[in-house]
């Protein structure tokens, strides 16, 4: 008799999550010297741990803790580069400049993204059929208490001038319900984080509209301000030549606003 | 290049008041806080405090508050400090220094002398 | 607040030799692996010049004869070998919690 299983309203874990999370692990220490010293098995071992026959509903930080203590990580922390809506752009700008780090540049971040996982309450597997989605379901699910454990302690990780992409083309420019205006935001420290610099990517070619001025970015300038942290915001209306002009910033068309 | 220039030195009796000018170039000034920092005559470093130049907000080190006042003025790029009722005590060299939280831009100091 | 204490007050350093200045703070200044500790050097009559920010960064226009180093509570500047313009007045300061506070400064004269 097939013993009945919770159906939930998102996706179930991806396809080969074991093999994918070990690997990626043992990929990204083979390429940052810096964390070569991590055991991959037991980073699986904890990353399992925090979800396996734990109600996927129940799901705390707390259970990250032996993960985020395996894959504990010094990032330049006035090299950090937020995102929103706008992860693709993101990480095509941080392989270009290198001294440059999105969170899915740091060990924890590169074995999550884009994956998603959940277990059973009270058994050891994995389940492959679907998982809780964050709003029809619950919040305090694995993959969202991931991102939000990582995030807030990348946020709170953060010094000097912080700098975070966001997408022009959408309605909220700035989400208060993302990641970035949920949890990073709140979580940059003002004794540390001098200004946080937002760079709004244009979609349009023809689009010469300032998006700096739109609602929800000043909505994002009065958040930053009341907690004492400088806001700056530059549009940028050429994403293509924007990246074109990192790779070759010699470039005499690099010169003229983009 | 980024500069940071203060005025000239004063010379000022007790009980009077000082305002302290730094003007900055090659950078734009409400993208970084300005903080003050003091010198007495060959003693060591003091932090007073630093103002949000995008908001204007001033955070003041326990020592500076009541007398010092840190303000601004974006149309000419320039932070102010003021000091009231002078005390022999506050003859010092003035610093204003960019943020971040270290200190890699310094205006040249501004020498205030309080003697009756 | 965070107390910084500089040791020696003072040294004398002959040229091509090794000047060791350290700062101990009364806790910890490091934050997710950063270490939030800066030096500085002022000559007479100048401002503070920045040397090494964040422990071991070496400021941009500063030689490689100057180097941090420590993290926690113990940090050293080292500069090796010493040049006759190096007579100044250092001071580390640490910017991990409000308020910043500097050492009291250590005297570097050259024999």
């Known amino acids: 008799v097939p013993r009945w299983r919770q159906q939930w309203s998102g996706p179930g874990t991806t396809k080969r999550f074991p093999e994918t999370v070990l690997a990626r692990c043992v990929k990204y220490t083979e390429i940052h010297p810096e964390m070569r010293h991590v055991d991959c098995q037991s980073v699986w071992d904890a990353f399992k741990g925090a979800f396996i026959s734990k109600h996927p509903c129940n799901i705390t930080e707390e259970d990250y803790q032996p993960l985020m203590k395996l894959g504990t990580q010094t990032v330049p922390c006035n090299k950090i580069l937020l995102w929103s809506r706008i992860k693709d752009l993101a990480h095509q700008f941080t392989q270009v400049q290198r001294d440059m780090f999105t969170l899915e540049d740091t060990l924890l971040g590169y074995l999550a993204d884009d994956l998603t996982w959940c277990g059973e309450f009270n058994t050891s597997k994995i389940n492959y059929q679907s998982c809780p989605d964050w709003r029809k379901d619950c919040s305090n699910n694995p993959v969202s208490v991931f991102w939000k454990t990582v995030s807030r302690r990348f946020a709170e990780a953060a010094c000097d001038v912080v700098h975070v992409m966001l997408n022009g083309s959408r309605s909220k420019i700035f989400d208060k319900n993302s990641t970035f205006g949920s949890v990073e935001v709140h979580n940059l420290q003002p004794e540390k984080v001098q200004t946080l610099e937002a760079w709004v990517i244009h979609g349009g070619r023809e689009d010469s509209r300032d998006l700096c001025q739109d609602p929800t970015i000043k909505e994002l300038e009065s958040i930053i301000s009341k907690r004492n942290i400088q806001f700056s915001c530059k549009n940028i209306y050429r994403p293509d030549k924007f990246l074109q002009c990192v790779k070759n910033p010699e470039d005499s068309s690099c010169t003229s606003e983009i | 290049q980024i500069q940071l220039v203060q005025s000239g030195s004063e010379l000022k009796k007790p009980g009077a008041s000082v305002k302290v000018s730094c003007k900055a170039s090659?950078?734009?000034?409400?993208?970084?806080?300005m903080n003050w920092v003091r010198q007495a005559p060959g003693q060591g470093l003091e932090w007073m405090g630093w103002?949000?130049?995008?908001?204007?907000?001033?955070t003041y080190a326990d020592d500076f508050k009541g007398r010092f006042v840190f303000s601004l003025d974006t149309s000419v790029s320039t932070a102010y400090l003021q000091i009231s009722s002078l005390k022999a005590e506050d003859t010092a060299v003035y610093y204003c220094?960019?943020?971040?939280?270290?200190?890699?831009?310094w205006g040249q100091g501004t020498l205030v002398t309080v003697s009756s | 607040d965070i107390v910084l204490t500089q040791s020696p007050a003072s040294l004398a350093v002959s040229p091509g030799q090794r000047a060791t200045i350290t700062c101990r703070t009364s806790?910890?200044?490091?934050?997710?692996?950063?270490?939030?500790m800066h030096w500085y050097q002022q000559k007479p009559g100048q401002p503070p010049k920045l040397l090494i920010y964040r422990a071991s960064n070496l400021e941009s226009g500063v030689p490689a004869r100057f180097s941090g180093s420590g993290s926690r509570t113990d940090f050293t500047l080292t500069i090796n070998p010493v040049e006759a313009n190096d007579t100044a007045n250092y001071y580390c300061?640490?910017?991990?919690?409000?308020?910043?506070?500097f050492g009291q400064g250590t005297k570097v004269e050259i024999k």
């Open positions: 103002i949000n130049t995008y908001t204007g907000e001033p």
């Open positions: 300061q640490q910017s991990n919690e409000d308020p910043w506070t």
């Open positions: 220094a960019r943020y971040p939280g270290w200190f890699a831009y």
């Open positions: 806790e910890s200044v490091d934050s997710y692996g950063n270490s939030f």
């Open positions: 090659g950078y734009a000034l409400t993208n970084y806080g």
